[in-house]
Interface confidence: low
């Protein structure tokens, strides 16, 4: 049985300040059941950017219909990028549970922010 992989195809993305950043993430399987979360940074101090299951993330939208059961694309768009958004973003698959437990992380995508074009 092939184990699920979390694929972040872009090692880095460069976006001008004020624009939107698209961070790509796909998974290779619907198994195991559980939500996707996006984080900036790694380790205990990482910042939650988006949780598929719950929460309010006004600057984040999903590129595809992430609630549909056959969906395997968990790419997100972050609007109105500022220099404070720079960092490495990780797409992380969780296994359903009580609580949900981390199953596998993507390799990360480094977001760099260019100066706003004059």
């Amino acid at each position: 049985e092939e184990e699920l992989q979390v694929i972040q195809p872009d090692k880095s993305v460069s976006v001008a300040a004020g624009e939107s950043a698209i961070l790509h993430c796909t998974v290779t399987s619907l198994i195991p059941v559980g939500p996707i979360q996006w984080f900036r940074g790694a380790g205990p101090a990482r910042e939650l950017i988006y949780n598929q299951k719950e929460g309010h993330f006004p600057r984040v939208t999903t590129v595809s219909e992430s609630t549909k059961r056959e969906n395997m694309d968990f790419s997100i768009s972050i609007s109105n990028i500022t220099p404070a958004d720079a960092g490495t973003y990780y797409c992380v698959k969780f296994r359903k549970g009580s609580p949900d437990t981390e199953f596998k992380s993507g390799a990360g995508t480094e977001l760099s922010v260019r100066a706003k074009p004059s």
Epitope: I31, P32, V33, T67, R95, T101
Partner: antibody, heavy 118, light 108 residues
Framework: DVQLVESGGGVVRPGESLRLSCAAS????????MSWVRQGPGEGLEWVAG????????WYADSVKGRFTISRDNSKNTLYLRLFSLRTEDTAIYYC???????????WGLGTLVTVSS | EIVLTQSPGTLSLSPGETATLSCRAS??????LAWYQQKPGQAPRLLIY???SRATGIPDRFSGSGSGTDFTLTISSLQSEDFAVYYC??????????FGGGTKVEIK
């Protein structure tokens, strides 16, 4: 054809134990999370417990936590539920149900009746 | 825990009529809601998942709609075999997974 066949129900006294089994056939058992759902006499449906596809994660309703244990043997295509410290309010038909993606139940067994009575 | 409230408790209709069943969630469950049919002495049967997608083999007279907290199951042109109890179930914020209390559709 997908088939789920429960067994092991019966009449027990309060405080006693029981083990329910669910034999699965007609699908790749190890590719699915599984659950037990019960229905008291003349009552609605109550989700009892669930288990991840390889058995590494289990979760329970508050009403049975610490008293019931869900497990599975993928080599035997069998789901189990051990019921300890049974109470009269545990009297119900216990259904084995296959979870689809997103945790709804696409196939159900016919159920096995557990009666707890002094 | 998300509470699902189904209404009405009982619906008395004649064959050929349309049944409209409601399910309200205490929190937003997006489109993560399923509907089941249960006849006396039988196990539940999946009708609708993802709020509006019909399960395999379910006739198109069954349709689901809604998202967020308010959902509807509509059975158009009721057939004799449709008289049963119907349950909704959320899977948007589980576990625990929760079911509604059920709506009985009976012959008038």
């Amino acid at each position: 054809d997908v088939q789920l066949v429960e067994s092991g129900g019966g009449v027990v006294r309060p405080g006693e134990s029981l083990r329910l089994s669910c034999a699965a056939s007609g699908f790749a058992f190890s590719d699915h999370d599984m659950s037990w759902v019960r229905q008291g006499p003349g009552e609605g449906l109550e989700w009892v417990a669930g288990i991840s596809l390889r058995g590494g994660v289990t979760w329970y309703a508050d009403s049975v936590k610490g008293r019931f244990t869900i497990s599975r043997d993928n080599s035997k295509n069998t789901l189990y539920l051990r019921l300890f410290s049974l109470r009269t309010e545990d009297t119900a038909i216990y259904y084995c149900a296959r979870e689809s993606w997103n945790t709804f139940f696409d196939y159900w067994g016919l159920g096995t009746l557990v009666t707890v009575s002094s | 825990e998300i509470v699902l409230t189904q209404s009405p408790g009982t619906l008395s209709l004649s064959p050929g009529e349309t049944a409209t069943l409601s399910c309200r969630a205490s929190q937003n469950v997006r489109s993560n809601l399923a509907w089941y049919q249960q006849k006396p002495g039988q196990a539940p049967r999946l009708l609708i998942y993802d709020a509006s997608s019909r399960a395999t083999g379910i006739p198109d007279r069954f349709s689901g709609s809604g998202s967020g907290t308010d959902f509807t199951l509509t059975i158009s042109s009721l057939q004799s075999e449709d008289f049963a109890v119907y349950y909704c179930q959320q899977y948007g914020n589980g576990p625990p997974l929760t079911f509604g209390g059920g709506t009985k559709v009976e012959i008038k």
